[in-house]
Amino acid sequence: QRFAQAQQQLPLESLGWDVAELQLNHTGPQQDPRLYWQGGPALGRSFLHGPELDKGQLRIHRDGIYMVHIQVTLAICSSTTASRHHPTTLAVGICSPASRSISLLRLSFHQGCTIASQRLTPLARGDTLCTNLTGTLLPSRNTDETFFGVQWVRP
Amino acid sequence: QRFAQAQQQLPLESLGWDVAELQLNHTGPQQDPRLYWQGGPALGRSFLHGPELDKGQLRIHRDGIYMVHIQVTLAICSSTTASRHHPTTLAVGICSPASRSISLLRLSFHQGCTIASQRLTPLARGDTLCTNLTGTLLPSRNTDETFFGVQWVRP
Amino acid sequence: QRFAQAQQQLPLESLGWDVAELQLNHTGPQQDPRLYWQGGPALGRSFLHGPELDKGQLRIHRDGIYMVHIQVTLAICSSTTASRHHPTTLAVGICSPASRSISLLRLSFHQGCTIASQRLTPLARGDTLCTNLTGTLLPSRNTDETFFGVQWVRP
């Protein structure tokens, strides 16, 4: 049977094409450095196909190697703001289950007002990813300035 | 029939592997903030497999979720140049059809001379992507410093 | 035969899913600007599925278009350190075979302490990728701050 037909017959999820792109919903209360995310077609260009949101954090549904990417822009910022409020740091990590807790990606703003990066990492079903923004500066909720996503790449 | 055989028999386009990587051709005239791109094997390592160029702007040929990425480096730049000429901003968006016009990705240079980012976004056949560089500084045309690309990820 | 079954029967390598994510091992001796990488499950979250390491440099095993990504963070760094030691530059390129030598991706640190970028590029079996860090500042070996990877995207 040709792959083109198989593609039409099998649900996309069985091909392992899990993918999500999220927009910022809000920051946590004062002692909680986590960013809280939201996604779905009603919200614009964000979506979840496979992964799910659990209280604003992204939970993985399929084992595999994922490309994780993020961009965060500070709401009020100039190069001097960023350096005066240093360190302002963004870290993406697995925050649960606790046994798998690890930092995957970390960047500081220094004299910039935006950080953007990406990496490949193995993730397992049930892993929850948290994005921690430490410091006093608030991130922008503009959907073209702040976003977070994952793409399943291979088993 | 084995997938390996199917891969050989079916044209790659039917597998949905649309992809493009472009290099800077030129900037627009004074009132036009758009960057104009070029691609093809004769130009080096740039290419278009599926998407097309329409007057230097990238037009999508297949509906789906795409990874869009860009890097732009300013040509004559130091951290003091960048801050003195602030705001210099790069925005990637859908510029036509007008009904779908939206900014997808936005970054400011602040005290840096390079911006680089990527995001997942749904695109539709016929969407044209524009990259607007606002400010007085010129981008480098070096192919390892300034480039723009898309990769089809899933339907 | 269903693709889901084909997926299980065929080795992943035949599907063209070559992928690698590396962590920094060490820098080169004084006159060698190359970064030396390492990867494998024993080292944490780094891995090589298809590509191989040759004396700390990444060698490609399958022709195709790849997404190449990198993040490098300087070890002891502030915005003033970075600007005082300018230029500190990171370049990713094909360093062998010599006939295919070319710079693929280049970024300067200016007043920042981290660079991160990604691009699509054609690579051929036998291409070896080198990452050259020029300047006097040392990179961090923290696995969430400095990493380098490739992902096969299409033939």
Partner: nanobody, 119 residues
């Protein structure tokens, strides 16, 4: 269309003070942040101060230490106290609200109030 209503602008000598007020309809007082943008002639609009729903504040470098943003929940009002004003603070000041909404967010603006600082 929800409108934010600003007041308090005017003319003042350098070194003087003004207090801007922004009244918001009660139904939008669940916000990510409320803040004040300003736009001087020929310049881009810039965000100069914001206050979050839980009272955190951020300021632009140019106004930090001189301007103070605050809110009165009972009156659904946000204030911008501007001290030690400088000629370069001359601009139209706009109240802004980034509001939680069913569609992710809504953004609301005031009509603007002119602040003129003479030397």
């Amino acid at each position: 269309e929800v409108q934010l209503v600003e007041s308090g602008g005017g003319m003042v000598q350098a070194g003087g003070s003004l207090r801007l007020s922004c009244a918001a309809p009660g139904k939008i007082f669940s916000f990510y942040f409320m803040g004040w943008y300003r736009q001087a002639p020929g310049k881009q609009r810039e965000l100069v101060a914001l206050i979050t729903g839980d009272g955190r504040t951020n300021y632009a470098d140019s106004v930090e230490g001189r301007f103070t943003i605050s809110r009165d929940n009972a009156k659904n009002t946000v204030y911008l106290q501007m001290n030690s004003l400088k000629p370069e603070d001359t601009a139209v000041y706009y109240c802004y609200a980034d509001v939680f909404a069913r569609a992710g967010r809504d953004e609301y603006w005031g009509q603007g109030t002119q602040v003129s600082v003479s030397s």
